[in-house]
Amino acid sequence: MASAGMQILGVVLTLLGWVNGLVSCALPMWKVTAFIGNSIVVAQVVWEGLWMSCVVQSTGQMQCKVYDSLLALPQDLQAARALCVIALLVALFGLLVYLAGAKCTTCVEEKDSKARLVLTSGIVFVISGVLTLIPVCWTAHAIIRDFYNPLVAEAQKRELGASLYLGWAASGLLLLGGGLLCCTCPSGGSQGPSHYMARYSTSAPAISRGPSEYPTKNYV
C-alpha cells in the first residue's frame, strides 16, 4: 500500500514538474532587465525568453515579438530550445511508460513487468529532470557571468527571470518524482526474483540449503 502511495506521489510530482517545465520553456522571462539596488537600470524593461522577447515601455505598454528565424539565433539559445523541448518529450514518454506499468492499469498483467516499467519511467523522469536543468543552469551562468563582466554594457546586463526559477522547480520535481518511482520498485521487483529462486530450489532437491537460507516469506 505504501508502495502505491509512493508511486502516486511520484507521478503527481513529475506531472507538476512537467507543467512547470512547459510554463518555464514558454514564458519569455528567462532573462530580465537588471535592477541595481531599487532603481531600474532603464525605463525600457526587456524580457527575453527562448521563443520571444518583450519590451515594457515606461508608459506600461508591452510589446512582444517571436524570434524571426531559427538560424539567426545564437547557438546557446538554439541549444536551450532543443533541450527544453526534448526534456518535455522525454517526460511525456516517461508518463506513458509509467501508465503502462502502473498498479491500477491492466496494460501489463505481470507484476515483474509492471515493476520494471515503473522503474524505467522513474529513470526516464530523472533524465528529463537533468535535461531541464542543463539549459536553466547554463542560462543562469551566462547571466551571472555577464552581470559581473565590466565589458558588458549596463543596458545589456540581465537578471535571472521567473522562467529560470520555474525551470529549477520543474527539474527538482522531475528528479524527486522520478526518484520516488525508482524507489517503489525494489519492493515490487524483489518479489519476482526471490519467488523464482524459491520455486527453483524446491523443484531441485539436489541443491541442499540450510533452512535459514530460504526466504520464509515465499512459503505458503
Epitope: 537600470v41 525605463a43 539565433l73 543596458a155
Partner: antibody, heavy 123, light 106 residues
C-alpha cells in the same frame, strides 16, 4: 518623429575643454541610453561612451575614461559630452546616438543619430 | 577589448555588381553585430541589426549573415546611391566599430 539635435561647431585651443549638447525629442528621453561616437577627419568611427538618462549612470571607452564626462538633464531631454585636456588629435565630428532594443533578435543598435558637431582643436 | 577586423578597406565596383564585405571579431559576439552606411558629411545610417535583420525601410538588396566571430555583409546588386563607406559594429562587449570599407565607383 525621433530627432537628436546637436550644438554647433566649436574651435578650441589645446588643453581646453569642450561641451557638446544633444537635445532629444519625439520619444521618452529616459527610456533609451544615449551614446557618443566620434570620427576624426578621413578616419573611422570610434565609440566614446554612453549614459543611462533614467539614472545618470555612465559607461566609458577606456581610451577616453580619464578625459570624458557624459551627463544629462532630464528636464530638457538633453545629453552632454564634455572632453577635457584637448589635443590636436581630438579634432573630429562628435555624434550622439540613441541605443534601441530590437525585438525578435535580442539585439541592440544605435538607431537614431544626431547631425554631428565638428570640434576643431587648434593653437 | 574586442577588435573588429573589416575587409577589404576599400573596393571598386560597378553598378549592378555584387559586393561582399567581411567583418571578423577577435572573440565571439554572438549575433550582436550591426552594419552601417555612411556618406560624406552625414551621420551613419543603420542597415542591418542582429547580424542578419534588415532595418525598416532599407532595400532588400542589402543583407547580412554570420554569428560568433565571422560576419558577411552583401549588396546583391550595387546601385548608384550605394557608393559610400560601410562599417560593422559589435555590441556584445560595449561597442566596437570595424575600420570601415569604402565602396567606390570603378
Amino acid at each position: 518623429e525621433v530627432q537628436l539635435v546637436q550644438s554647433g561647431a566649436e574651435v578650441k585651443k589645446p588643453g581646453a575643454s569642450v561641451k557638446v549638447s544633444c537635445k532629444a525629442s519625439g520619444y521618452t528621453f529616459t527610456g533609451y541610453y544615449m551614446n557618443w561616437v566620434r570620427q576624426a577627419p578621413g578616419q573611422g568611427l570610434e565609440w566614446m561612451g554612453e549614459i543611462n538618462p533614467a539614472t545618470g549612470s555612465t559607461t566609458y571607452n577606456q581610451k577616453f575614461k580619464a578625459r570624458v564626462t557624459i551627463t544629462r538633464d532630464t528636464s530638457t531631454s538633453t545629453a552632454y559630452m564634455e572632453l577635457s585636456s584637448l589635443r590636436s588629435e581630438d579634432t573630429a565630428v562628435y555624434y550622439c546616438a540613441r541605443r534601441d532594443y530590437y525585438l525578435g533578435s535580442n539585439s541592440y543598435a544605435l538607431d537614431y543619430w544626431g547631425q554631428g558637431t565638428l570640434v576643431t582643436v587648434s593653437s | 577589448d574586442i577588435q573588429m577586423t573589416q575587409s577589404p578597406s576599400s573596393l571598386s565596383a560597378s553598378v549592378g555588381d555584387r559586393v561582399t564585405i567581411t567583418c571578423q571579431a577577435s572573440q565571439s559576439v554572438s549575433n550582436n553585430l550591426n552594419w552601417y552606411q555612411q556618406k560624406p558629411g552625414k551621420a551613419p545610417k543603420l542597415l542591418i541589426y542582429g547580424a542578419s535583420k534588415l532595418e525598416d525601410g532599407v532595400p532588400s538588396r542589402f543583407s547580412g549573415s554570420g554569428s560568433g566571430t565571422d560576419f558577411t555583409f552583401t549588396i546583391s546588386s550595387l546601385q548608384p546611391e550605394d557608393f559610400a563607406t560601410y562599417y560593422c559594429l559589435q555590441h556584445r562587449y560595449l561597442w566596437t566599430f570595424g575600420q570601415g570599407t569604402k565602396v567606390e565607383i570603378k
